[in-house]
Interface confidence: low
């Protein structure tokens, strides 16, 4: 399987909410001994391998933000811990999973990575990740809503916070 990042760049105004999205592309084994873990973390560019460094998102580690379920099941993170930090990661039945960050500040700017691990019990795992950049802007040049740039082309798309989940 692979992980697709529909958007490689998100440009948002300060104070806005944004939902960063990844998509799990098949084939996905739905056997009873197959477990999927999905999570998010921050990283930095200029490394030997993108996303190899794992830094917290608003002080929450990738362990704190993980989703655990089999196949294409829906799941949510532990609400109390994440929501206290203005975060929520979620997953739907179609392989899409996301992290929502509320009330963005300039400190949220950076490289974000989604990670999917397929674990077949008593066998090796398969790990894949996707990367995307978030730029939070302030001042008169900042957009009024988040602008996203698709990974496959340079066309941009204007989105509002509550519509993010529909852009898959």
């Amino acid at each position: 399987f692979k992980v697709a990042t529909p958007y490689s760049l998100y440009v948002c105004p300060e104070g806005q909410n944004v939902t960063l999205t990844c998509r799990l592309l098949g084939p996905v084994d739905k056997g009873h001994d197959v477990t999927f873990y999905k999570t998010w973390y921050r990283s930095s560019r200029g490394e030997v391998q993108t996303c190899s460094e794992r830094r917290p998102i608003r002080n929450l580690t990738f362990q704190d933000l993980h989703l655990h379920h089999g196949g294409h099941q829906a799941a949510n993170t532990s609400h109390d811990l994440a929501q206290r930090h203005g975060l929520e990661s979620a997953s739907d039945h179609h392989g899409n999973f996301s992290i929502t960050m509320r009330n963005l500040t300039l400190l949220d700017s950076g490289l974000y990575c989604c990670l999917v691990v397929e674990i077949r019990h008593h066998h090796s795992e398969h790990r894949v990740h996707g990367a995307m950049e978030l730029q939070v802007q302030t001042g008169k040049d900042a957009p009024s809503n988040c602008v996203v740039y698709p990974s496959s082309s340079q066309e941009s798309e204007n989105i509002t916070a509550h519509h993010h989940h529909h852009h898959h």
Epitope: Q49, F62, Q63, D64, V117, H121, H122, H123, S124
Partner: antibody, heavy 121, light 108 residues
Framework: QVQLVESGGGVVQPGRSLRLSCAAS????????MHWVRQAPGKGLEWVAH????????YYADSVKGRFTISRDNSKNTLYLQMNSLRAEDTAVYYC??????????????WGQGTLVTVSS | EIVLTQSPATLSLSPGERATLSCRAS???????LAWYQQKPGQAPRLLIY???NRATGIPARFSGSGSGTDFTLTISSLEPEDFATYYC?????????FGQGTKLEIK
Amino acid sequence: QVQLVESGGGVVQPGRSLRLSCAASGFTFSSYAMHWVRQAPGKGLEWVAHIWYDGSNKYYADSVKGRFTISRDNSKNTLYLQMNSLRAEDTAVYYCARDSGFYESYYFDEWGQGTLVTVSS
Amino acid sequence: EIVLTQSPATLSLSPGERATLSCRASQSVSSSYLAWYQQKPGQAPRLLIYDASNRATGIPARFSGSGSGTDFTLTISSLEPEDFATYYCQQYNSYPYTFGQGTKLEIK
């Protein structure tokens, strides 16, 4: 700072049992996978067992499978290794090690100082 | 089981010299899931390098890792007195997780 403190080692006769403990502090224990690694006197390192962050999955080296049981109590921030049917070749310093991941294994980023287990008649 | 073979078993060098330690796997270690540890007598191992080439937090820049597939190398560019120890490679690609037998770096 992160601290892992092993205890429970000692001298035991072949065929007997022993339980090792590893008390963790300085990090969110319940978010990390953990391992036991051992080192026979004058020898190299040998991975023994691995447990997921929530205790739901456990993996063992063939040399200890069926004899050793890894477990954890997240409410007490403690990792355990129950060792049954001990053999002379189990004599080693046993290290508790934190995994950098929470389920599947990555590298071991923190280690305890170890506890010595001697199996001898 | 992936068998890791380290060479040389012992390496005798002087402070200031460059040390090159090798770790060869019996089968390919996918995604470079290989780590290096340093261990001094009476102490626990310490993580130096992960994912074959990434330095762990607090590890000096003189330590570097390279390689992929079946051949991996740990290089210490200019040896400091505190670097004389035993070094182990470890793969975390598949169960059982295995270590090399170690390379002892001693003062010449």
